[in-house]
Interface confidence: low
């Protein structure tokens, strides 16, 4: 999906009113310096195609986030603020509801998180330079 | 747009009283289970959490170099945070942000992560 026509700013905002807090939910009990961010993302388009990547895609390790509250937020934004991303994602969901597992918060799920709140950062700040 | 503005900075002689305010736009504080606060940025120093306040319950944290000087407030009828600095020092001097995606706890609000939505707002304390 070409993330392109997305509104950001409308993304941003649900970002700040609900997703980095259940980002930051998630991560409780956990220091914010122990992960090294080592995804990052050079522009909206591709922030959003990298936190979509590491928020529904399993990964060796973690499963599956999709589940999760901050997961099925961000699923609702980018249907309701990225022109035609829902109808991408249908044959994806049918898929993931045949392999649902139960729920296993791993070390692994902890550092792809933390590479989420590194991703989400990035996106909300367009005009920062790269490091 | 989401925008914060702060204001209240300016200069003050030690011993001293100021009273910064955050006001957003964009979004209302009443609406969102944010916790609020702010940090600071002296001249060739890093970013400093100094406090900040729960949206959920009113909780306040503070850093320990300003426990007991600086009050926390917000008022969501006026959509603003403020920070009410008594007693002010010399190395209170900095650039003051406030910001909304943070998250304080009793780990401490120096602990995370700031990301300066506003130009703050400049207090400089002289001896």
């Known amino acids: 999906y070409d993330f392109t026509n997305c509104d950001f700013e409308k993304i941003k905002a649900a970002y700040l009113s609900t997703i980095s807090k259940d980002l930051i939910t998630y991560m409780s009990g956990t220091k914010s310096t122990e992960f090294n961010n080592t995804v990052s993302c050079s522009n909206r388009p591709h922030c959003l195609t990298e936190i979509q990547s590491l928020t529904f895609n399993p990964t060796a390790g973690c499963a599956s986030l999709a589940k999760e509250m901050f997961a099925m937020k961000t699923k609702a934004a980018l249907a309701i603020w990225c022109p035609g991303y829902s109808e991408t994602q249908i044959n994806a969901t049918q898929a993931m509801k045949k392999r649902r597992k139960r729920k296993v918060t791993t070390n692994k799920c902890l550092e792809q998180v933390s590479q989420l709140q590194g991703l989400w950062r990035r996106f909300n700040r367009p005009l920062l330079k790269q490091q | 747009e989401v925008q914060l503005v702060e204001s209240g900075g300016g200069l003050v002689q030690a011993g001293g009283s100021l009273r910064l305010s955050c006001a957003a736009s964009g979004f209302t504080f009443a609406d969102y289970d944010y916790d609020i606060g702010w940090f600071r940025q002296a001249p060739g120093k890093e970013r400093e959490g100094v406090s900040c306040?729960?949206?959920?319950?009113?909780?306040?944290y503070y850093t320990d170099s300003v426990k007991g000087r600086f009050t926390i407030s917000s008022d969501n009828a006026k959509n603003t945070v403020s920070l009410q600095m008594n007693s002010l020092k010399p190395e209170d001097t900095a650039v003051y942000y406030c910001a909304v995606e943070i998250h304080c706890d009793d780990y401490g609000v120096e602990n995370f992560d700031f990301d300066p939505w506003g130009q703050g707002t400049l207090v400089t304390v002289s001896s």
């Open positions: 306040i729960s949206n959920r319950d009113g909780s306040t």
